[in-house]
């Protein structure tokens, strides 16, 4: 597993700020876990990075992800005046130059090395829930969220509004 050290956080902040040509509102280094407290970990295997959802052993260090927060116009804005219809999007980077990507064709979540500017597949609309969990909706495919399936991250279509609080698309962010 790999992560970003606390020291790297600030150099990364400078590095990332020009990714989309606009600066992020803020950046936050956090470990990512599921609603059921399983950790999201990242491992190098056969020259590519794999993402796992697993129970960590006692005292095992959690991987960290750099979340960069961007503001964007919400596409269903009726008023068209730019005042209404904002949304908060994040990119998630567990190590330098790699970002989580939505692969909508394969319904998978992958780590890709990226050129700047980042593609839309690397952006996720951030939702925060009353449980103080968050969920990540694909910018490129509204209604599709990062979720947990068979101990891996996958893209999950949330068909009915009632499923927005379903546990497999809820994640916890923690500084520790």
């Amino acid at each position: 597993a790999f992560g970003i050290s606390g020291v790297q956080k600030y150099t990364r902040a400078l590095h990332d700020s020009s990714i989309t040509g606009i600066s992020p509102i803020t950046e936050y280094l956090a470990s990512l876990s599921t609603y059921n407290d399983q950790s999201i970990t990242f491992a190098l295997e056969d020259e590519s990075y794999e993402i796992y959802v697993e129970d960590l052993k006692k005292d095992e260090k959690k991987d960290k992800v750099l979340l960069s927060y961007y503001e964007s116009q919400h596409p269903s804005n009726e008023s068209g005046d730019g005042v209404d219809g904002k949304m908060l999007m994040v990119t998630l980077s567990p190590t330098k130059d790699f970002w989580l990507h939505a692969n909508n064709k394969e319904h998978s979540v992958e780590l890709h090395k990226c050129e700047k500017p980042l593609p839309d597949q690397a952006f996720f609309v951030l939702h925060n829930m009353h449980s103080n969990c968050v969920s990540f909706e694909c910018k490129t495919d509204p209604g599709v969220f990062i979720g947990v399936k068979d101990n891996h991250l996958a893209l999950i279509k949330v068909d009915s509004s009632e499923n927005l609080c379903t546990e497999n698309i809820l994640f916890k962010l923690s500084e520790t």
């Epitope: 509102i25 919400h74 209404d84 904002k86 908060l88 939702h127 509004s161 009632e162 609080c165």
Partner: antibody, heavy 122, light 107 residues
Framework: EVQLVQSGAEVKKPGASVKVSCKAS????????MNWVRQAPGQGLESIGD????????FYNQNFKDRATLTIDKSTSTAYLELSSLRSEDTAVYYC???????????????WGQGTLVTVSS | DIQMTQSPSSLSASVGDRVTITCHAS??????LSWYQQKPGKNPKLLIY???KLHTGVPSRFSGSGSGTDFTLTISSLQPEDFATYYC?????????FGQGTKVEIK
């Protein structure tokens, strides 16, 4: 233009219930959580709770958990707050307030209703 | 619950003065802090969100700063229409909570 229009002032007796409405227009109602905030005379702002109009999912501040009920009517883009077992200390102006960001609470409340004064007196 | 503490609770100032109001959060809220202005008998108005982003239509004499637990609202040159009560509010986690308010009065 986004507007939140609330129902008129109410006078209630202790022990009664009150239902305040908030009609939204000018945006996609289901996209943004609606919060309810109250302000007692000469006091500060206190969040009662909020509701996700898409799912009907609600959150109540602990102080109001047993007495407040938040509902929505998607067909009329209206949010409702019902407060039961009223007491004199519930005398306050009640506001509905729409979240700034689609899907999240991080940006605070960008649009507010005009407020509904609820007076509880015997 | 995250407690929000504003200071001072009230202040007297003159037109043209620079005014600073602070808000302290009981735990880290990153930049997820909003500031509101409220005049008597009116609803609150959003001034600043995400700690430092000026809401559309708000005069540039208003500015916000801070992250983590400590935040500041500054009015660079107080105008007659700025005499009001100001509230901070955290949006990081539920329940969403407000500061107790700072009343800015005419000296």
């Amino acid at each position: 233009e986004v507007q939140l229009v609330q129902s008129g002032a109410e006078v209630k007796k202790p022990g009664a219930s009150v239902k305040v409405s908030c009609k939204a227009s000018g945006y996609t109602f289901s996209d943004y959580n609606m919060n309810w905030v109250r302000q007692a005379p000469g006091q500060g702002l206190e969040s009662i709770g909020d509701i996700n109009p898409k799912s009907g999912d609600t959150f109540y501040n602990q102080n109001f958990k047993d007495r407040a009920t938040l509902t929505i009517d998607k067909s009329t883009s209206t949010a409702y707050l019902e407060l039961s077992s009223l007491r004199s200390e519930d005398t306050a102006v009640y506001y509905c307030a729409r979240h700034y960001y689609y899907g999240s609470s991080y940006g605070g409340f960008v649009y507010w209703g005009q407020g509904t004064l609820v007076t509880v007196s015997s | 619950d995250i407690q929000m503490t504003q200071s001072p609770s009230s202040l007297s100032a003159s037109v043209g003065d620079r005014v600073t109001i602070t808000c302290h959060a009981s735990q880290n809220i990153n930049v997820w802090l909003s500031w509101y202005q409220q005049k008597p008998g009116k609803n609150p108005k959003l001034l600043i969100y995400a700690a430092s982003k000026l809401h559309t239509g708000v005069p540039s004499r208003f500015s916000g700063s801070g992250s983590g637990t400590d935040f500041t609202l500054t009015i660079s040159s107080l105008q007659p229409e700025d005499f009001a009560t100001y509230y901070c509010q955290q949006g990081q986690s539920y329940p969403l909570t407000f500061g107790q308010g700072t009343k800015v009065e005419i000296k």
